[in-house]
């Protein structure tokens, strides 16, 4: 349905508050280095313009596309060339090339200062003094650091952020009330950002078909009672929503997401029995709730898959008539029966099935050729099952910190060229799979673990893409989206790696480590561990453990000393010497 003025249409659909918030997010995700005040000014100008279009859709420029309007506005920024360099060249292009150019310059790891949380009283004062600016600043700071954050979901986070301050700034113990809530929002926000980053990577690097396959599998697991036609409709709509958000079309994305939530709730009887509570909530909570809703129970008496996909004489006929529809039905039928499988495993099975049909439907006796196709699934299913079993046993034996360290060593040996901060960040996140998933019963472990690992490995892929240093990482990241995890799992020690030169400065520590939080202290130690492995890739587990134990004892000793700095200087030299001797450096 065409509208005379797209900007007026979206302003009316979304309302002024959401419109302004979404434009701010869009601008902050594109121009990640611009000061807050500059963005607010641009947003206000766009909002005033939108209001004129609401009043008169035929007014000048109101018929322009949102990309044209927003791009023109971004290109008015005076310091574009100085701040962003070649990104300024985007402004010489016409739409849609200009928007594509802006998208290509989004930076997953922008050079921005770490967000430091002020004292609670300072935050509460700022909140009370100017609530609107305080919340806008939250949107701005998150959006610029997470340029692919799912915008309508960020509105939901902002709503919870506001609620936390509204409640806790009146509490007797403000800090006790507020800090856990902020920690929870931070952790959930990081997870949400990483999950959305995978969706965008899937769309942008592997195309709409890959995303749709993922969506068919996930929605079929979640809504196993919904019919294939219903799931297909939801997949089409969901793909549109995510394509828009990943493409920077945040107003359209938020509007379409609201429409999709409305449709799901109006048709919940045909979709899932688990949606009732979600559908009673206000819009932002409703959409979030639907996205996180638990899997519905499987319909009773689902027949054998073999009947339609192996035993039927019409398999090749049905496949030839509409390949993607038939494969989609296979994926739907398999996924709804297997909430215990990861989405990526289901996609591997579908790929195997597709490959088999491609080969067999051209053979002399197709049925004889594909009769045993389900037997080929067995090793594909057992591989992640065994891997998860082994790693959960290791996690239960070591605990999270030491499990992370084991992964740090494992991954540094696989891809030692990757930067130390990236290896630390990714391995720490990989290690969190233990506490996140190993507590689950068997039936929930694989979807939890392998789909989470897909999200974390995508972080490695997008960070590595910015500055490629390892052919092995590039290969695992680009060859197959669903085989990324098995590809990384299969990597052995990189024998071609030339060990890093020893630099004593890397292993020099100061008294400031004593005032760090437990988490930050762990990161310092884990950074040292990665550097050790880069210097001595052939070091054994036992050698590394001994050095790390000595290092932990050294930090503990010096943090208890009266003259901490002297202790770190003197004992540090001894530790470096002892470590060099122990590792044969």
């Amino acid at each position: 349905d065409a509208h005379k003025s797209e900007v007026a249409h979206r302003f009316k659909d979304l309302g002024e508050e959401n419109f302004k918030a979404l434009v701010l997010i869009a601008f902050a995700q594109y121009l990640q280095q611009c000061p807050f005040e500059d963005h607010v000014k641009l947003v206000n100008e766009v909002t005033e313009f939108a209001k004129t279009c609401v009043a008169d859709e035929s007014a000048e420029n109101c018929d322009k596309s949102l990309h044209t309007l927003f791009g023109d506005k971004l290109c008015t920024v005076a310091t574009l060339r100085e701040t962003y360099g070649e990104m300024a060249d985007c402004c010489a292009k016409q739409e849609p090339e200009r928007n594509e150019c802006f998208l290509q310059h989004k930076d997953d790891n922008p050079n921005l200062p770490r967000l430091v949380r002020p004292e609670v009283d300072v935050m509460c004062t700022a909140f009370h003094d100017n609530e609107e600016t305080f919340l806008k600043k939250y949107l701005y700071e998150i959006a610029r650091r997470h340029p692919y954050f799912y915008a309508p979901e960020l509105l939901f986070f902002a709503k919870r952020y506001k609620a936390a301050f509204t409640e806790c700034c009146q509490a007797a113990d403000k800090a006790a009330c507020l800090l856990p809530k902020l920690d929870e929002l931070r952790d959930e926000g990081k997870a949400s950002s990483a999950k959305q980053r995978l969706k965008c990577a899937s769309l942008q690097k592997f195309g709409e078909r890959a995303f749709k396959a993922w969506a068919v599998a996930r929605l079929s697991q979640r809504f196993p009672k919904a019919e294939f036609a219903e799931v297909s409709k939801l997949v089409t709509d969901l793909t549109k929503v995510h394509t828009e958000c990943c493409h920077g079309d945040l107003l359209e994305c938020a509007d379409d997401r609201a429409d999709l939530a409305k449709y799901i709730c109006e048709n919940q009887d045909s979709i899932s029995s688990k949606l009732k509570e979600c559908c009673e909530k206000p819009l932002l909570e409703k959409s979030h709730c639907i996205a996180e809703v638990e899997n519905d129970e499987m319909p009773a008496d689902l027949p054998s898959l073999a009947a339609d996909f192996v035993e039927s004489k019409d398999v090749c006929k049905n496949y030839a008539e509409a390949k993607d529809v038939f494969l989609g039905m296979f994926l739907y039928e398999y996924a709804r029966r297997h909430p215990d499988y990861s989405v990526v495993l289901l996609l591997r099975l579908a790929k195997t099935y597709e490959t088999t049909l491609e080969k067999c439907c051209a053979a002399a006796d197709p049925h004889e050729c594909y009769a045993k196709v389900f037997d080929e699934f067995k090793p594909l299913v057992e591989e992640p099952q065994n891997l998860i079993k082994q790693n959960c046993e290791l996690f239960e034996q070591l605990g999270e910190y030491k499990f992370q360290n084991a992964l740090l060593v494992r991954y540094t040996k696989k891809v030692p060229q990757v930067s130390t901060p990236t290896l630390v960040e990714v391995s720490r996140n990989l290690g969190k799979v233990g506490s996140k998933c190993c507590k689950h019963p068997e039936a929930k472990r694989m979807p939890c673990a392998e789909d989470y690992l897909s999200v974390v490995l995508n972080q490695l892929c997008v960070l590595h893409e910015k500055t490629p240093v390892s052919d092995r990482v590039t290969k695992c990241c680009t060859e197959s989206l669903v085989n990324r995890r098995p590809c990384f799992s299969a990597l052995e020690v990189d024998e071609t790696y030339v060990p890093k030169e020893f630099n004593a400065e890397t292993f020099t520590f100061h008294a400031d480590i004593c005032t760090l939080s437990e988490k930050e202290r762990q990161i310092k130690k884990q950074t040292a561990l990665v550097e050790l492995v880069k210097h001595k890739p052939k070091a054994t587990k036992e050698q590394l453990k001994a050095v790390m134990d000595d290092f932990a004892a050294f930090v503990e000793k010096c943090c208890k000393a009266d003259d901490k700095e002297t202790c770190f200087a003197e004992e540090g030299k001894k530790l470096v010497a002892a470590s060099q001797a122990a590792l044969g450096l």
């Epitope: 009672k225 919904a226 019919e227 009887d269 045909s270 129970e297 319909p299 009773a300 008496d301 689902l302 027949p303 054998s304 898959l305 073999a306 009947a307 339609d308 192996v310 035993e311 029966r337 389900f374």
Partner: antibody, heavy 117, light 107 residues
Framework: ELQLVESGGGLVQPGGSLRLSCAAS????????MHWVRQAPGKGLEWVSA????????YYAESMKGRFTISRDNAKNTLYLQMNSLKSEDTAVYYC??????????WGQGTQVTVSS | DIVMTQSPSSLSVSLGDRVTITCQAS??????LAWYQQKPGQTPKLLIY???RLQTGVPSRFSGSGSGTSFTLTISGVEAEDVATYYC?????????FGQGTKVELK
């Protein structure tokens, strides 16, 4: 061709027990559901119980929970229904069936269970 | 439990008549409905599954329609061999439930 053959029916006193068997042949996979359905004399069909062949999950009609137990032996390709504390209203023909709601649907010929003193 | 209410409970028909049997579910069962035919002294035979899909080997005069809570089995031109009792079955959730049956006989 898949075949289902029930056995184990007969005459039993109220409060007694009976174990029905259903021998299956011709299976090509194990991702399906097997059912017991009964039909009292001159009455309609009544679903009794079901079991998923692959993972052994079981389901029962409310009135039979606690008294009836469905099980299967994969190695023997046999379905069972252990019936305890039998009542006269359990008198019926008991059918075993595979996938009662799909094209891959098969029924046995049924076995008569009579509960009478 | 989901209750399936079939109507009518019986009907007398002439050869060639168009027959309609309805089945009402006490809650939305989407399209998880099957229709069975049972002739005296025989095992039940599946006619329709998925509310409207004709089982292989079943004559095309049988058809099923409906979704949600209201379903229909139609025999477009009754033949003598169609004398039987017809049952609907919901298989959305356990416990599975049958309708009470509709007995079709010739006038």
């Amino acid at each position: 061709e898949l075949q289902l053959v029930e056995s184990g029916g007969g005459l039993v006193q109220p409060g007694g027990s009976l174990r029905l068997s259903c021998a299956a042949s011709g299976f090509t996979s194990d991702d399906f559901v097997m059912h017991w359905v009964r039909q009292a004399p001159g009455k309609g069909l009544e679903w009794v119980s079901a079991i998923r062949w692959d993972d052994g999950s079981t389901y029962y009609a409310e009135s039979m929970k606690g008294r009836f137990t469905i099980s299967r032996d994969n190695a023997k390709n046999t379905l069972y229904l252990q019936m305890n504390s039998l009542k006269s209203e359990d008198t019926a023909v008991y059918y075993c069936a595979k996938s009662v709601s799909a094209s891959s649907n098969y029924w046995g010929q049924g076995t008569q269970v009579t509960v009478s003193s | 439990d989901i209750v399936m209410t079939q109507s009518p409970s019986s009907l007398s028909v002439s050869l060639g008549d168009r027959v309609t049997i309805t089945c009402q579910a006490s809650q939305n069962i989407i399209s998880y409905l099957a229709w069975y035919q049972q002739k005296p002294g025989q095992t039940p035979k599946l006619l329709i599954y998925g509310a409207s899909r004709l089982q292989t080997g079943v004559p095309s005069r049988f058809s099923g329609s409906g979704s949600g809570t209201s379903f229909t089995l139609t025999i477009s031109g009754v033949e003598a061999e169609d004398v039987a009792t017809y049952y609907c079955l919901q298989h959305l959730t356990y416990p599975l439930t049958f309708g009470q049956g509709t007995k079709v006989e010739l006038k």
